[in-house]
Amino acid sequence: CKAMHVAQPAVVLASSRGIASFVCEYASPGKATEVRVTVLRQADSQVTEVCAATYMMGNELTFLDDSICTGTSSGNQVNLTIQGLRAMDTGLYICKVELMYPPPYYLGIGNGTQIYVIDPEPCPDSDF
């Protein structure tokens, strides 16, 4: 079977600052030199793109400047960080990996990471 398997953690809890990190690992059936990684958010049956980056194997992963994602790559493993998360952003985040070059193309879709985000309690006013 030449399908590409993608593994990611089932659950991640975002920090109090709204930052969530997880590893997306893929088993490559081919020797890709160019890889695209996309984070998708699935809510009900709707799937939307959160962020995407293309990288050359051996080079760093770079998202657009205005992206809420950052990441690093090491071999067939990508360390993803999503920032600026609020409680309303709690949901299933899917890691999608595409081997873009050279042909053939391969698609790999993870089962998704449920990210839980809890908004921090506002600091109580204090009178001195």
Partner: antibody, heavy 118, light 108 residues
Framework: QVQLVESGGGEVQPGRSLRLSCAAS????????MHWVRQAPGKGLEWVAV????????HYVDSVKGRFTISRDNSKNTVYLQMNSLRAEDSAVYYC???????????WGQGTLVTVSS | EIVLTQSPGTLSLSPGERATLSCRAS???????LAWYQQKPGQAPRLLIY???SRATGIPDRFSGSGSGTDFTLTISRLEPEDFAVYYC?????????FGQGTKVEIK
């Protein structure tokens, strides 16, 4: 709502060229791979070509390699299929198709008919 | 290249009956990357099922997909008049993207 509208089909002689266009609307065009799929009269579906995101990466079915070129203009939300050295066996309805975020072909245009005949 | 073979070629059934369509792959296909499409005469295909078993937006629950490895099935629990059409399976996990040859569901 998502719309894909093909144009440029018609009847041409073998060996001639034709350029198909597909105007897309209702979604963030540059975030999707765009495909061409064809269907010969009374036959099944055959994938022809795909162009990815920024247009640098493309893939073709073996039977059209070296004759067909897929391209896209993200500023115009349009994908093209330049078909050269056309053969009778290229006669088909050509569909412009969006590759969904999870990979399946989620939206299809209405198709444009290409007839190659002498 | 992954070859998909559909059976039967034609299925003759009456409205209200159950339809079972088969799609067999020449090599193992991850269920994440198997889709089913419906095509009516003079129309473009429409996505019914993706990921072998997930219904696309707006698809009635009488359509269901199942299977893994090399054997996949599309089931229409109770045929409605509008379900008589041609159905195609497709794999989209690697290039070249391939379709089965189609199964025609016709009125008996």
């Amino acid at each position: 709502q998502v719309q894909l509208v093909e144009s440029g089909g018609g009847e041409v002689q073998p060996g001639r060229s034709l350029r198909l266009s597909c105007a897309a609307s209702g979604f963030t065009f540059s975030s999707y791979g765009m495909h061409w799929v064809r269907q010969a009269p009374g036959k099944g579906l055959e994938w022809v070509a795909v162009i990815w995101y920024d247009g640098r990466n493309k893939h073709y079915v073996d039977s059209v390699k070296g004759r067909f070129t897929i391209s896209r203009d993200n500023s115009k939300n349009t994908v093209y299929l330049q078909m050269n050295s056309l053969r009778a066996e290229d006669s088909a309805v050509y569909y412009c198709v969006r590759g969904g975020q999870l990979g399946a072909f989620d939206y299809w245009g209405q198709g444009t008919l290409v007839t190659v005949s002498s | 290249e992954i070859v998909l073979t559909q059976s039967p070629g034609t299925l003759s059934l009456s409205p209200g009956e159950r339809a079972t369509l088969s799609c067999r792959a020449s090599q193992s296909v991850s269920s994440s990357y198997l889709a089913w499409y419906q095509q009516k005469p003079g129309q473009a295909p429409r996505l019914l099922i993706y990921g072998a078993s997930s219904r696309a937006t707006g698809i009635p629950d009488r359509f269901s997909g199942s299977g893994s490895g090399t054997d996949f099935t599309l089931t229409i629990s109770r045929l409605e008049p509008e379900d008589f059409a041609v159905y195609y399976c497709q794999q989209y996990g690697s290039s070249p993207w391939t379709f089965g040859q189609g199964t025609k569901v016709e009125i008996k």
